[in-house]
Interface confidence: medium
């Protein structure tokens, strides 16, 4: 089990680092988006795990962004960001669609309402229960 957990961590960390870089290979990214969406978490250890991902980096004050699957829907009243950015992406996650391209990558500023903690603990708990 410890070996499985280490392997899982390695896969997840690689998925995060390579997020969005290859539009032809999005299965791992979509799976991880789904994990974040379902477990209400963001990143592996912390949301900051996403900050090194080049494709999510903007300029200046927009340098910190995370995938929309990190977004805490229950914590916002901002209907604009919900309707225009978040909900279309999460509806795809909800239906487990497999039709995303790099141009569609949905990212929100880190100062948005995003989940407070990483997914490691939740996934490890799931592994132990299965």
């Amino acid at each position: 089990r410890a070996q499985l957990e280490r392997s899982l961590r390695d896969v997840v960390e690689k998925t995060i680092q390579k997020y969005g870089t290859n539009p032809e290979e999005t299965a791992a990214e979509e799976s991880w988006d789904y994990v974040q969406f379902q477990l209400r978490c963001c990143g592996w250890h912390y949301p900051q795990d996403w900050f090194q991902v080049l494709i999510l980096r903007g300029n200046g004050s927009e340098a910190h962004r995370v995938p929309c699957s990190c977004y805490n829907l229950s914590a916002t009243n901002d209907s604009t960001i919900l309707d225009k950015v978040i909900l279309p992406q999460l509806s795809r996650l909800g239906h487990l669609a497999r039709s995303r391209h790099s141009a569609d990558i949905c990212a929100v500023p880190a100062e948005s309402h995003i989940y407070r903690e990483g997914c490691a603990q939740g996934l490890q708990k799931w592994l132990h229960n299965n």
Partner: antibody
Framework: EVQLVESGGGLVQPGGSLRLSCAAS????????MNWVRQAPGKGLEWVSI???????DYASWAKGRFTISRDNSKNTLYLQMNSLRAEDTAVYYC?????????????WGQGTLVTVSS | DMTQSPSTLSASVGDRVTITCQAS??????LAWYQQKPGKAPKLLIH???TLASGVPSRFKGSGSGTEFTLTISSLQPDDFATYYC????????????FGGGTKVEIK
Amino acid sequence: EVQLVESGGGLVQPGGSLRLSCAASGFSLSYNAMNWVRQAPGKGLEWVSIIFASGRTDYASWAKGRFTISRDNSKNTLYLQMNSLRAEDTAVYYCAREGSTWGDALDPWGQGTLVTVSS
Amino acid sequence: DMTQSPSTLSASVGDRVTITCQASQNIIDYLAWYQQKPGKAPKLLIHKASTLASGVPSRFKGSGSGTEFTLTISSLQPDDFATYYCQQGYSNSNIDNTFGGGTKVEIK
């Protein structure tokens, strides 16, 4: 009404142990990150520990190894187990809710419970 | 670490008061301000650097992002004489304290 009530403070000798409790009402501990913060007499606020909704924990570097944060979801109660206590651990200890979204602040706070470490 | 200044501030009713908080790294806007009165628990004033907590008077204003943050009280009231703390909510990993050292606002 959302409320936190601490208990378990008191006088303890150096090297001794104490377990603080924080009873929550009006919300569920299991869906929130919860913190312990302390304040030595006449000093500022000092963060001690956090337990996330998932059960993962973090500690201030000085608290690692001596202090343990935990919770009992069935009792909706947060705990802080303090071992190998020293005189410098004398303080009022507060529990506070943080929520589940990154950037949530501590609100509400309990009234605090005084821990005195002295021989 | 969070560096708060000044540690003590003497002011009169009606004064405009400014307290600053500096983070040792970029904390985006994950900063809160608290007010504490003697013998009482801290009370949340501002979260996410500039969002006023429920029931807090509009004379309190938070600003800043990244590493530099400011709490401004536009017109000091008798009830505002207290100690104010900033706190970063960016990370709890491998740190000594998430709070600044505090600023005591006292009567001049």
